[in-house]
């Protein structure tokens, strides 16, 4: 959960239930403002951030993003629909969170910050969307051996790999701020 | 052209009601969260209630909860305020106003309508 | 409940710089409330300068400028106009609904 939640920063009226906006806003900034402290770690480490052969370690990801048909768009907005596709996207997030843990020194605790406060991100917004079943969780054998197989690859395709996630993963949570703020 | 037209104010009685409404045009009304503001007579403005683009969620001002309800139809892009019980520190002018989607969107209110409750 | 507080009024001289603030009767104001700054001046209808804290609306002189200092939210105008002289509404998105701060009325002296 992220900093400035306790009790002498918010007015006793006014706690938030976990599902509104505000709280759904700063948990989603939080978990941004972790991410960038990662992307630092990584862009200062190696060279990936400038790299032109993103394409060759994409093949091997299959990373959520948001389309048109979600409906997270300004154009063909659909909250329902695109409720479920953020729920979705960050379940399927999780295994590549998990994949970052060990791929940091110095900022080890912000890789399991990142990891917890998505966690709890997703239970705040299954919350909200308590009347959709439309929510698929990932099949853990898969995730599993997909682990595997991304911990298998070569130092290089270790270090665009994570470059990738962290890219994809700030991607897809800034289109999910702006969708928020239409439901 | 964006244009926010309000209708639906007059004069009621204390615990009368009254239905406002909203017709948008010149923009993808269904994409936005849309809302009610008011400012009574020679104060500041006061925000009424919200509602989500799909109208899934709904959202109240604590003056209000209870005796207002929001909604919409997103095949007329209108939005709708009923109004029960009402009360006379309910007189106010009521604006409605879309939300903001991208960096430099312009933002557009109506000319508002005048409800007054008194007896 | 907690209040969305202004100053009641400010004056500022032709081509000077101002600030107005909006902070929170309990609690710092953050990026997650999104603060919007309105303009209104007498018989008109409110219009918005700034929301989601810096993005200025369409329109916007570039005078106007938002921020959010310490643990409140900021209007800064730089170089007043006499046009700039009307009444400046906060407001701020709190737990699922959004308050107005009570207004602050600007003077351009002069």
């Known amino acids: 959960v992220p900093p400035g939640e306790d009790s002498k920063d918010v007015a006793a009226p006014h706690r938030q239930p976990l599902t509104s906006s505000e709280r759904i806003d700063k948990q989603i900034r939080y978990i941004l403002d972790g991410i960038s402290a990662l992307r630092k770690e990584t862009c200062n480490k190696s060279n990936m951030c400038e790299s032109s052969k993103e394409a060759l370690a994409e093949n091997n990801l299959n990373l959520p993003k948001m389309a048109e048909k979600d409906g997270c768009f300004q154009s063909g907005f659909n909250e329902e629909t695109c409720l479920v596709k953020i729920i979705t996207g960050l379940l399927e997030f999780e295994v590549y969170l998990e994949y970052l843990q060990n791929r940091f020194e110095s900022s080890e605790e912000q890789a399991r910050a990142v990891q917890m406060s998505t966690k709890v991100l997703i239970q705040f917004l299954q919350k909200k969307a308590k009347n959709l079943d439309a929510i698929t969780t990932p099949d853990p054998t898969t995730n599993a051996s997909l682990l595997t197989k991304l911990q298998a690859q070569n130092q290089w395709l270790q270090d665009m790999t994570t470059h990738l996630i962290l890219r994809s993963f700030k991607e897809f949570l800034q289109s999910s701020l702006r969708a928020l703020r239409q439901m | 052209q964006v244009q926010l037209v309000e209708s639906g104010g007059g004069l009621v009685q204390p615990g009368g009601s009254l239905r406002l409404s909203c017709a948008a045009s010149?923009?993808?009304?269904?994409?936005?969260?849309m809302y009610w503001v008011r400012q009574p007579p020679g104060k500041g403005l006061e925000w009424v209630s919200a509602?989500?683009?799909?109208?899934?969620?709904?959202y109240y001002g604590d003056s209000v909860k209870g005796r207002f309800t929001i909604s919409r139809d997103n095949a007329k892009n209108t939005v709708y305020l009923q109004m029960n019980s009402l009360k006379p520190e309910d007189t106010a002018l009521y604006y409605c106003?879309?939300?903001?989607?991208?960096?430099?969107?312009?933002?557009?209110w109506g000319q508002g309508t005048q409800v007054t409750v008194s007896s | 409940q907690t209040v969305v507080t202004q100053e009641p009024s400010l004056s500022v001289s032709p081509g000077g710089t101002v600030t107005l603030t909006c902070g929170l009767s309990?609690?710092?104001?953050?990026?997650?409330?999104?603060p919007g700054w309105f303009q209104q001046t007498p018989g008109q209808a409110p219009r918005a300068l700034i929301y989601?804290?810096?993005d200025r609306h369409s329109g916007v002189p570039s005078r106007f400028s938002g921020s959010i200092s310490g643990n409140k939210a900021a209007l800064t105008i730089t170089g007043a106009q006499p046009e700039d002289e009307a009444d400046y509404y906060c407001?701020?998105?709190?737990?699922?609904?959004?308050?107005f701060g009570g207004g602050t009325h600007l003077t351009v002296l002069g």
């Open positions: 106003k879309k939300s903001t989607w991208a960096d430099g969107e312009s933002d557009y």
């Open positions: 010149g923009f993808t009304f269904s994409s936005y969260r």
């Open positions: 509602i989500s683009a799909g109208g899934g969620s709904t």
């Open positions: 309990s609690g710092s104001v953050t990026a997650s409330n999104y």
């Open positions: 989601s804290t810096n």
């Open positions: 407001a701020l998105d709190i737990g699922d609904i959004t308050e």
